[in-house]
């Protein structure tokens, strides 16, 4: 059991509050973290209070001002990026979403040594990416889907693509789907160690099919958003990938990489790129049947200017019991010998874990294993590999960074952070300098977030970078929930929970429960991690207990619960989460007529679904931007889970699995509907479809739509939405406003 | 607008060395807009690459010459310049300098080409 | 190296009538490919570029077309300076090569 933080003395509990839903929603309880933006081993910018750009060196201990906030004023910049040989400095203003990664922004070149700015030759705007060279000054930008690329600040550029057309052909940058499903990135360009090549995806979305939603705005007539949005079994982009020669640019055509053979033969994805050498590049690739994934290495052919990717240096990657990789295939990380790699996937035993392959993947040696998964590598050193895992006491929702000497032989592993702050900090991650010489470790909980600086060799803390003193100090006098994470045991599955219970929990009275659902594939909810959100404020102020439940699909707890759910969504999630309440329930303090679920995105799927269950444990249930029928949604993401939605393949599946499917079923429950109109992620048809199929059914439900919002729900729709949704949950549970 | 001027001399004796010189008016070689190439034609073989240059001294040459082959820039005189070593009979041709856009817009100016022939 | 293959050798044509080039690559060029025109005693002039795009002050009759290995030139009515010999270039590649050129004579 996790209390956070520690009691006062019951005779200054009259002085502490609960926490209110206006805190919640000011953001009044948020904490900082502190990641160095390296750049070297033992030098760091960061940004400070009043807006300076600082370097640190660790070494010395010395810091100066390398850039004044006066300057970022001046163009009202919001973010900066320092070029490698540190003569410039890029200043990024009118910063202008588009999807989850992805923004348009004006950039501005400053000349540190002149303390000017770059004057002509301007860069054009709005740019949709933009970033330096790793050596030098050369900068490599996207515009209306064309790359250019300046071999100095102030010289004019090279265009390096002429057939990039919005919506059509995306060159350097992903479209909606790559972006979402696949890189997760802004980019699609990626720069060889000493930027001598520049490799980057042209994506061609001309056959895809479009999503189309109005966008209300404020004039007479609304516009219309277009997207090329692939759905489950539509016409995909078809990738390319690209090398230019940097040192004489668009001299001639760009290089293409060839695709392998075993890859190619049918609809396939580009999934990553990972330069090893300036002359050697690794490709991997995935059949759009997403159970087949190809690491291809290339190299440069010095005498034809080409890239050769030979068979001998394709592995195969393949999953006989689910898709290839967690969300996404794992990527290499080279060693020194620029042939071998350490990579992350499955072991005989179903758990995913650290593999060396030095020649073919059959032959790869396994560095980590046992009854707990590797979850990201962070550097190889000569002699260091640095992860992270949820080994420790075998709590798959923690994270700790270990240390395996890989210089020395049996290679010994040390665990870096598991006893550092054992009751504050169970949840890491890591940021490391060149060559592993500093790292900082980023504690995220279960008590209040702190950020350290580490020596890379002894392992020791050098400083604290930020503690959240203030925050700790806000949180004197707040009655914060108790939270509790174990496990029930269930036919053989374990399912964790945590439980969130009110600050003055009696076991021996009844509380509501209100069950919080997200549940997709390779998702965790179950996390040793601090938050005071919405739900802290429900167990806090409304005295309402909540659980959020890991069941199978989840993640890092080895492919037997992961890949359960392949080919049938909507069926194990939902049946998890009601043996979980039964459960509940029968440890005696919940009010069994007052249970309720909610979830957002593919939460709301659940929630519907469970809700929609017939077991008659819920009376009431949110569903927030839900996905109500895998049909609606993006093929990278339904088709690693589903296959295709075809005769022959899982189409039956697809049908069954639906929210309309289970209209009437949700006769006796209270079902409140909400979605963004401008959502272009889980699209608006989604909810439409559901408020159908219930009017169609003659079934009484409650919506609320918010007009030109995303997935997100950001902005005043926030406060509305969790104003709204308490009011609901406080209705249901007949709680007093 | 843009000219390009070819100069040198037009008789070459075996195994000395070709050079030749293209002067650029009404345009500068050191605008990072363009790469500056020399091409050759001779009866047997056609049009041929020779190489490129670019204002910041970079440059890459048909492999099949590469040996031989050096091309360099002066901006302050605004000219660039081709010397082919060791040259044979084979090397007679007419040599032309252009200015050169790149892949996507080809050598969009030439000069008039100067005719060199290579004999004893 | 790509090899460029154009055909015609030579092409004898009344003015008015319609020319058809083509260029044929040893492998993929994508659509980095440009036509040059020569004329006795000239430098070659840049007709197309990108294998379907008019260069500056080059006229409507003339027009380029293809992707990957084969490439045509098209002029669609002769005019007495058309007559000429006409190169194709590849750019895909090191080392960029010429084609031998297609000559384009009186009838």
């Known amino acids: 059991i996790v209390l956070r933080p520690s009691r006062v003395h019951n005779s200054e509990e009259n002085t502490m509050r609960a926490l209110t839903l206006k805190d919640i929603l000011n953001g009044t309880f948020s904490y900082k973290t502190f990641f160095p933006n390296w750049i070297s081993g033992q030098e760091y910018l960061h940004q400070s209070a009043d807006n300076n750009i600082v370097l640190y060196n660790i070494e010395t201990g010395q810091s100066y001002t390398i850039l004044s906030n006066r300057t970022m004023k001046s163009v009202n910049a919001s973010n900066y990026g320092l070029s490698p040989d540190r003569q410039f400095v890029y200043l990024e203003s009118d910063y202008s979403k588009l999807w989850r990664y992805s923004y348009t922004a004006t950039y501005y070149i400053y000349d540190l040594s002149n303390g000017e700015f770059v004057r002509g030759n301007e860069l054009p705007r709005p740019i949709q990416y933009l970033c330096w060279s790793p050596v030098g000054s050369k900068l490599a930008y996207v515009y209306q889907n064309n790359i250019y690329l300046k071999q100095r600040p102030g010289d004019p550029p090279f265009q390096i693509t002429f057939n990039g057309r919005e919506n059509k052909i995306f060159n350097g940058i992903p479209d909606w789907v790559y972006e979402e499903e696949m890189l997760a990135t802004k980019y699609a360009l990626w720069w060889s160690p000493n930027g001598k090549f520049l490799a980057y995806a042209e994506f061609n979305d001309t056959d895809i099919p479009v999503i189309a939603y109005s966008y209300y705005g404020d004039e007479q007539y609304p516009r219309t958003i277009n997207i090329p949005y692939p759905k489950a079994g539509a016409k995909n982009p078809v990738v390319r990938i690209f090398i230019i020669d940097t040192t004489y640019p668009a001299y001639v055509g760009p290089q293409e990489v060839p695709v392998p053979a075993m890859i190619a033969s049918s609809d396939y994805y580009f999934s990553w790129l990972t330069w090893v050498t300036d002359e050697r590049v690794c490709l991997q690739w995935l059949k759009r049947v997403q159970n087949v994934s190809v690491l291809s290495i290339c190299d440069f052919r010095e005498d034809w200017q080409t890239w050769d990717c030979p068979k001998t240096q394709e592995h195969i990657e393949e999953s006989r019991t689910g898709w290839a990789g967690g969300f996404f295939v794992s990527t290499p990380v080279f060693s020194y010998d620029a042939i071998s790699y350490y990579k992350i996937f499955s072991d005989k035993d179903g758990y995913k874990h650290i593999h060396y392959i030095k020649d073919t993947v059959e032959n790869a040696i396994q560095i980590t294993s046992g009854k707990w998964e590797a979850i990201n590598i962070f550097r190889v050193t000569q002699d260091s590999l640095f992860y992270s895992s949820n080994e420790f006491e075998e709590y798959p929702g923690r994270r700790n960074i270990y240390r395996i000497s890989i210089g020395s032989y049996p290679p010994s592993k040390k665990c870096v952070t598991c006893h550092l702050r054992k009751e504050r900090c169970q949840y890491y991650t890591a940021s490391f300098s060149d060559y592993a010489k500093y790292y900082a470790l980023v504690c995220y909980g279960p008590g209040i977030p702190i950020s350290t600086l580490h020596d890379g060799r002894t392992d020791q803390e050098i400083k604290i970078l930020e503690e959240n003193k203030e925050l700790e100090n806000a949180l004197k006098n707040i009655q914060l929930p108790k939270e509790e994470i174990k496990k029930l045991e269930v036919d053989e599955i374990t399912l964790w929970y945590k439980m969130i219970l009110p600050p003055q929990f009696d076991r021996s009275k009844k509380y509501p429960l209100l069950i919080q659902v997200y549940g997709g594939p390779c998702s965790q909810s179950v996390r040793s991690v601090f938050a005071v959100n919405w739900i802290s404020y429900l167990a806090s102020k409304e005295g309402m207990v909540i659980a959020l439940v890991d069941g199978r699909g989840t993640a890092f707890q080895g492919d037997k619960l992961l890949y359960a759910v392949y080919r049938k969504l909507g069926v194990y999630e939902v049946e998890d989460q009601i043996t979980a309440v039964r459960k509940f329930i029968e440890m005696g303090f919940i009010d069994e007529k007052r249970i309720a679920i909610w979830g957002w995105s593919y939460g709301g799927y659940v929630s519907s679904l469970a809700l929609a269950s017939g077991t008659g444990l819920f009376k009431c249930g949110i569903a927030v931007a839900p996905v109500s029928s895998w049909e609606y949604y993006a093929s990278v993401y339904t088709e690693r889970f589903m296959g295709l939605p075809t005769k022959d393949d899982n189409l039956e599946h697809y049908k069954n699995s639906t929210v309309m499917a289970r209209a009437e079923y949700f006769r006796n429950v209270d079902y409140l509907l909400i979605h963004g109109t401008a959502d272009d992620n889980v699209h608006f048809q989604n909810s439409a479809q559901i408020a159908k199929a219930l009017v169609n059914a003659q079934v009484d439900f409650q919506a609320m739509w918010y007009s030109d919002q995303n997935h997100g729900l950001s902005g005043l729709s926030t406060n509305h939405l969790y104003t709204h949704m308490t009011h609901f949950l406080k209705q249901c549970f007949s709680l007093s406003d | 607008q843009v000219q390009l001027q070819e100069s040198g001399p037009g008789l070459v004796k075996p195994s000395e060395t070709l050079s030749l010189t293209c002067t650029v008016s009404?345009?500068?070689?050191?605008?990072?807009?363009?790469?500056w190439s020399w091409i050759r034609q001779s009866p047997g073989k056609g049009l041929e690459w020779i190489g490129f240059?670019?204002?910041?001294?970079?440059?890459n040459y048909n492999p099949s010459l590469k040996s031989r082959v050096t091309i360099s820039v002066d901006t302050s005189k605004n000219q660039f310049s081709l010397k082919l070593s060791s040259v044979t009979a084979a090397d007679t041709a007419v040599y032309y300098c252009?200015?050169?856009?790149?892949?996507?817009?080809?050598?969009?100016?030439w000069g008039q080409g100067t005719t060199v022939t290579v004999s004893s | 190296e790509i090899v460029l293959t154009q055909s015609p050798a030579t092409l004898s044509l009344s003015p008015g009538e319609r020319a058809t080039l083509s260029c044929r690559a040893s492998?993929?060029?994508?659509?980095?490919l440009a036509w040059y025109q020569q004329k006795p005693g000239q430098a070659p002039r840049l007709l197309i570029y990108?294998?379907?795009n008019r260069a500056t002050g080059i006229p409507a009759r003339f027009s380029g077309s293809g992707s990957g290995t084969d490439f045509t030139l098209t002029i669609s009515s002769l005019e007495p300076e058309d007559f000429a010999v006409y190169y194709c270039?590849?750019?895909?590649?090191?080392?960029?090569?010429f084609g031998q050129g297609t000559k384009v004579e009186i009838k």
């Open positions: 990108d294998a379907s």
């Open positions: 009404g345009g500068s070689v050191s605008s990072g807009s363009y790469y």
């Open positions: 240059i670019y204002y910041s001294g970079n440059t």
């Open positions: 252009a200015r050169d856009r790149g892949y996507y817009y080809g050598m969009d100016v």
């Open positions: 492998q993929s060029v994508s659509s980095y």
């Open positions: 270039q590849q750019r895909s590649n090191w080392p960029p090569t």
